[in-house]
């Protein structure tokens, strides 16, 4: 089987959503957990993560082979404390298989703006107050 993990971000007003999406087959879901870590280059685990989610075992319909499970971590107002390196990961508690997504970063600037870099999806969002740029 093939399990794919991707990272993305979306902005709603002052809120920043960090999203980990895992695509997998129904039979691959059991025992799998997806999680988001910050500043954990070597020891990212569900226990040290910001948020974790068990993979969906049911896509809700029967006419599909693949399921998408989505973990969303919401930052209501980005501050300098949120600066750092983030990574989406997944781990099977049954087989021990471990997946690691690309690192991405939040950089908070002195002007009160922030930038999210390293994401696969190239987005550019600008806001007048506490501006955020996704690139």
């Amino acid at each position: 089987g093939c399990i794919n993990i991707t990272s993305s971000a979306s902005q709603e007003g002052t809120r920043l959503n960090l999203i980990c999406t895992v695509w997998h087959k129904k039979e691959e879901a059991e025992g799998f957990v997806v999680f988001l870590c910050k500043d954990r280059s070597g020891d990212c685990s569900p226990e040290t993560s910001l948020k974790q989610l068990r993979l969906k075992r049911d896509p809700g319909i029967d006419g599909v082979g693949e399921i998408s499970s989505q973990l969303m971590f919401t930052i209501s107002q980005v501050t300098p404390l949120h600066s750092g390196t983030y990574q989406c990961c997944a781990r099977s508690q049954k087989s021990g298989i471990r997946l690691q997504g690309h690192f991405f970063s939040i950089l908070f600037t002195e002007t009160g703006n922030y930038t999210v870099t390293g994401l696969k999806q190239r987005q550019h969002l600008e806001f007048s107050h506490n501006e955020g740029t996704l690139s």
Epitope: K26, R57, P59, G60, I61, D62, M72
Partner: antibody
Framework: QVQLVQSGAEVKKPGASVKVSCKAS????????MQWIRQAPGQGLEWIGA????????RVTQKFRGRATLTADKSTSTAYMELSSLRSEDTAVYYC??????????????WGQGTTLTVSS | EIVLTQSPATLSLSPGERATLSCRAS??????LHWYQQKPGQAPRLLIK???QSISGIPARFSGSGSGTDFTLTISSLEPEDFAVYFC?????????FGGGTKVEIK
């Protein structure tokens, strides 16, 4: 044993909103899709939408998009359906139902008792 | 959207007779079809899953068949408590949909 207990009957005026709750027990709430279905007097069953409490993914049929909001509270194992801009045609019994584990059951194996909504001026 | 068409709309039969209810899908849905029974004032009850698979606690006189677009629910010998409305429902794709129902009434 699995149980779905819905909130009581509601009477609303046209243009108002209603929020129906469905409290689940007897199974892992976050691992099954919760469906919302309605039945107008003397009519058939109409699927409104479904939510997966594990990650809050929701699907709402086109007819109700923008008017029906599905949410779930994992801490209380309760699903909610809010319907806004009510009109007289929304008068119906609203059911929540659990979709059984895919490939094992797949159909809606447990149903709430129904919540009667009356929309009248 | 997959449309499910049930026929007949009403079936008038006597206790002990055999009932054959049809459900036709507007496109192929494999075996992703389920049957429900509903009595007045009650919530529907799942009778058959995945076109032909039995459900625990449901009497053996209820059986289902079919695949693709044409499905059948058969009640081998009607009991007084079987007079009700029957719905089919597909779980193949979003949005999930129901058929319009077949009412089985006493002749």
């Amino acid at each position: 044993q699995v149980q779905l207990v819905q909130s009581g009957a509601e009477v609303k005026k046209p243009g108002a909103s209603v929020k129906v709750s469905c409290k689940a027990s007897g199974y892992t709430f976050s691992e099954s899709w919760m469906q919302w279905i309605r039945q107008a007097p003397g009519q058939g069953l109409e699927w409104i939408g479904a939510i997966y409490p594990g990650d809050d993914e929701a699907r709402v049929t086109q007819k109700f998009r923008g008017r029906a909001t599905l949410t779930a509270d994992k801490s209380t194992s309760t699903a909610y359906m809010e319907l806004s801009s009510l009109r007289s045609e929304d008068t119906a019994v609203y059911y929540c139902a659990r979709r059984g584990i895919a490939a094992v059951v797949g159909g809606f194996d447990y149903w709430g008792q129904g919540t009667t909504l009356t929309v009248s001026s | 959207e997959i449309v499910l068409t049930q026929s007949p709309a009403t079936l008038s039969l006597s206790p002990g007779e055999r009932a054959t209810l049809s459900c036709r899908a507007s496109q192929s849905i494999s075996n992703h079809l389920h049957w429900y029974q509903q009595k007045p004032g009650q919530a529907p009850r799942l009778l058959i899953k995945y076109a032909s698979q039995s459900i625990s606690g449901i009497p053996a006189r209820f059986s289902g068949s079919g695949s693709g677009t044409d499905f059948t629910l058969t009640i081998s010998s009607l009991e007084p408590e079987d007079f009700a409305v029957y719905f089919c429902q597909q779980s193949n794709s979003w949005p999930l949909t129901f058929g319009g129902g077949t009412k089985v009434e006493i002749k």
